[in-house]
C-alpha cells in the first residue's frame, strides 16, 4: 500500500532498516554511528549550498523473535516484516538504506511497489541485478565475473600469455555472505562467466580440493575460492601443490594486504588475490577505528549511504524539482558523488564502480605486490608489475590446461 | 590532448650523470606505466625500463640495471630517468613513452638528446 | 630475449605502390606491434595487437600474421608514408624492437 513519506517542506527523513540478519556480522552500534558521521557530513555540505533544510534518520528496528539467525539465511521476510512496521507507524523516509542480504533485498523488491529509492550495502547476488530502484553500494558479483572473464581471456601482458578457458570453483557451503553470491555467480549455468568458459567444476569437499592440487589428470590448473588466506590455510595446510596450479583468491574487502609490516606466508606463493584498491583516510576515522577491514567497508557503505543521498537531494532542491517522486526514486545511478573517502561512481544500474586490484605474492621480498589493477567502470586492465617476480615458471602465468601448446 | 614533453638536449662529459624529465598532461599520469626507450645513431630501439606512477612499481632491462634510475613525482605528474656514470655509448636520443595497454607506447615525448662528449 | 628480424632494411617504392613489411621473431609471439618514425621526430604507435590500428591511422594501413612471422600492409602508398617502420614485441620481457624498414621514395 501507498505510505506517505516523511520528505517534504525543509524537513527530509531517512529510513534506516536495522536488521538482525546482515551481510556482516557488525553491530548496529557502529552502522549507527556511520549513519549519524554521514548525516554531519550531508548538513555541513547542504549549509554549504545554502540551503537550510533539516535532515535526519530514523532507526527501525526489528524485533529479533523469529528472524534470528544473525546471517542472511533466515533474512527473507524480515525485510518485509520491518517495511510492515514502517507503514503501520505511516514513518517512511525519503529513502530506505538497508537491507544487505541478498534474500531480503530481492524478496522486497519483489513485493513491494517501490516509489522511493533503495540503497544497500549489499545485495551481492545476481537476483539483485538490474533493478530500477535500487543502489548497491559494495561491489555485486556481477562486478567480479566481468573482471574475471576480462582476465580469462587476456594473453597480451608478458606475465600472461596464455588465454584461460576452464576453471575449478571451491565452495562449500559455509562461505560469508559476499562469498556465497559470487561463488553463486560463477557456479551459475546461465552466468556470463559459465557462458564464456569452455570448462568448470565446483568442488565442494575440502578433500576434493585438495585432490586437484597434485592431480596430473585434472581438467584446469586453475581454482577460485573466496575468503581470506586463513581461509586458504584452513583448507590447503603446507600440502604440496602441482607447480602450474593458480589459485585466485577472492577477498575483496580487506586491505591487509597494503599494510606496511605484511610478509605474504609461504603457502601464498601459488595464489594470485584479488582484492579491492584501500582507501586512506578511514584508518583514522572515528566510526571505524574498533572495525575490521571487511567491517570498515559495510560501515563505510552505509555512511556512503547518506552521502549519496545528501548528494541527490542537493540537486533536487537546487533545481526546485520534488523528492517524492519516481524522478527521484530512478536517479540514484550513472553518478559521481564525493564519497566519505573520495568519488564514489555508480554505473548505469546503480552499482557501485570501483578499481580491484590482482596481487601476487613476490618470492625475492615474501610481499604482496600489485600485478594489475582492473577499472570495474570502463572494464579496462591497467597492468602495474610488467615482470612480476612469480614462483611459476619464466615469470608468466601457465597455461589453465597442462600440456597444452603455446598460444 | 595527451602530451608528453620532455627536457631539453643536455651535452656531458664522461663519468658524469644527467636527468632527463617527461612532463605528463592531458590525462591521469598515475593511470598509465610510463617507459624509457633509448635510440643511439644508427642503432635499433631499445626499452630501458617501466614505473608504474601509483604503486611506484619498477621494471628495468637488465642491460640498463645499473645505467639507469627511474623515479616520479606524481604531484607533477612528472617521470624522470637518471642516467649516471656517462659514456660515449651512452650518447643517444631518449624517450619516454606512456603505456595504455593493449596499446603499448601510444604517446610518446619529443625526445632528449644526450650527448657524452670530452 | 626474442629477438625480431625486419625485412627488408629498405625498401624503394613509388606513390601508389603496395608496400609489404615483414617482421621475424626468434620464438613464437602473440601479438605484435608497430610503430612509425619521420627523420627527427619520435615514433608514432601504428599498429598495436597485430591488427588494430592505432588513432588517426589511414585504413591503407593493415597487420597481419602470427607465431613468428609478422606483415605490415600499407594498400597504396601515400607521400606522407615515407618513414622508418618499427616492430616490437611484448610478449617476453624484456619488450625488443625490430631493426626497423626504412621505406623511400624509388
Known amino acids: 500500500s501507498q505510505v506517505s513519506q516523511n520528505c517534504h517542506n525543509g524537513s527530509y527523513e531517512i529510513s534506516v532498516l536495522m536488521m538482525g540478519n546482515s551481510a556482516f556480522a557488525e553491530p548496529l552500534k557502529n552502522l549507527e554511528d556511520a549513519v549519524n558521521e554521514g548525516l554531519e557530513i550531508v548538513r555541513g555540505r547542504l549549509q554549504n549550498a545554502g540551503l537550510n533544510v533539516t535532515v535526519n534518520a530514523t532507526f527501525m528496528y526489528s524485533d529479533g523473535l523469529i528472524h534470528n539467525s544473525g546471517d542472511c539465511r533466515s533474512s527473507t521476510c524480515e525485510g518485509l516484516d520491518l517495511l510492515r512496521k514502517i507503514s503501520n507507524a505511516q514513518r517512511m523516509g525519503c529513502v530506505l538504506i538497508g537491507p544487505s542480504c541478498t534474500y531480503s533485498t530481492f524478496q522486497m523488491y519483489l513485493d513491494t511497489e517501490l516509489s522511493y529509492p533503495m540503497i544497500s550495502a549489499g545485495s551481492f547476488g545476481l537476483s539483485c541485478d538490474y533493478k530500477e530502484t535500487l543502489t548497491r553500494l559494495m561491489s555485486p558479483a556481477r562486478k567480479l565475473m566481468y573482471f574475471l572473464v576480462n582476465f580469462w581471456k587476456t594473453n597480451d601482458l608478458p606475465f600472461k600469455t596464455y588465454s584461460w578457458s576452464t576453471s575449478y570453483v571451491y565452495k562449500n557451503g559455509t562461505e560469508t555472505e559476499d562469498c556465497f553470491w559470487y561463488l553463486n555467480a560463477l557456479e551459475a549455468s546461465v552466468s556470463y562467466f559459465s557462458h564464456e568458459l569452455g570448462f568448470k567444476v565446483v568442488l565442494r569437499q575440502d578433500k576434493e580440493f585438495q585432490d586437484i592440487l597434485m592431480d596430473h589428470n585434472r581438467k584446469s590448473n586453475v581454482i577460485i575460492m573466496c575468503g581470506g588466506p586463513e581461509f586458504l590455510y584452513k583448507l590447503k595446510g603446507d600440502r604440496a601443490v602441482a607447480e602450474d596450479i593458480v589459485i585466485i583468491l577472492v577477498d575483496l574487502f580487506n586491505d591487509q594486504y597494503f599494510e606496511d609490516n605484511v610478509t605474504a606466508p609461504d603457502y601464498m606463493k601459488n595464489v594470485l588475490v584479488l582484492t579491492l584498491s584501500p582507501g586512506n583516510s578511514l584508518l583514522n576515522s572515528s566510526f571505524s577505528r574498533n572495525l575490521s577491514p571487511t567491517k570498515r567497508d559495510f560501515a563505510l557503505a552505509y555512511l556512503n549511504g547518506i552521502l549519496l543521498f545528501g548528494h541527490m537531494l542537493k540537486i533536487f532542491l537546487e533545481n526546485g524539482e520534488n523528492i517524492t517522486t519516481p524522478k527521484f526514486a530512478h536517479a540514484f545511478r550513472n553518478l559521481t558523488f564525493e564519497g566519505y573517502d573520495g568519488p564514489v561512481t555508480l554505473d548505469d544500474w546503480g552499482d557501485v564502480d570501483s578499481t580491484m586490484v590482482l596481487l601476487y605474492t613476490s618470492v625475492d621480498t615474501k610481499k604482496y605486490k600489485v600485478l594489475l589493477t582492473y577499472d570495474t567502470h570502463v572494464n579496462k586492465t591497467y597492468p602495474v608489475d610488467m615482470s612480476p617476480t612469480f614462483t611459476w615458471k619464466n615469470s608468466k602465468l601457465p597455461n589453465d590446461i597442462t600440456g597444452r601448446g603455446p598460444q | 590532448e595527451v602530451q608528453l614533453v620532455q627536457s631539453g638536449a643536455e651535452v656531458k662529459k664522461p663519468g658524469a650523470s644527467v636527468k632527463v624529465s617527461c612532463k605528463a598532461s592531458g590525462y591521469t599520469f598515475t593511470d598509465h606505466n610510463m617507459n624509457w626507450v633509448k635510440q643511439a645513431p644508427g642503432q635499433r630501439l631499445e626499452w630501458m625500463g617501466v614505473?608504474?606512477?601509483?604503486?611506484?612499481?619498477?621494471n628495468y632491462n637488465q642491460k640498463f640495471k645499473d645505467k639507469a634510475t627511474i623515479t616520479r613525482d606524481t604531484s607533477a605528474s612528472t617521470a624522470y630517468m637518471e642516467l649516471s656514470s656517462l659514456r660515449s655509448e651512452d650518447t643517444a636520443v631518449y624517450y619516454c613513452a606512456r603505456d595504455n595497454y593493449p596499446n603499448y607506447f601510444d604517446y610518446w615525448g619529443q625526445g632528449t638528446t644526450v650527448t657524452v662528449s670530452s | 630475449e626474442i629477438v625480431l628480424t625486419q625485412s627488408p632494411a629498405t625498401l624503394s617504392l613509388s606513390p601508389g605502390e603496395r608496400a609489404t613489411l615483414s617482421c621475424s621473431a626468434s620464438s613464437s609471439v602473440n601479438y605484435m606491434y608497430w610503430y612509425q618514425q619521420k627523420p627527427g621526430q619520435a615514433p608514432k604507435s601504428w599498429i598495436y595487437?597485430?591488427?588494430n590500428l592505432a588513432s588517426g591511422v589511414p585504413a591503407r594501413f593493415s597487420g597481419s600474421g602470427s607465431g613468428t612471422d609478422y606483415t605490415l600492409t600499407i594498400s597504396s602508398l601515400e607521400p606522407e608514408d615515407f618513414a622508418v617502420y618499427y616492430c616490437q614485441q611484448y610478449h617476453d620481457y624484456p619488450p625488443t624492437f625490430g631493426g626497423g624498414t626504412k621505406v623511400e621514395i624509388k
Open positions: 595487437r597485430t591488427s
Open positions: 614505473m608504474n606512477p601509483k604503486f611506484g612499481t619498477i
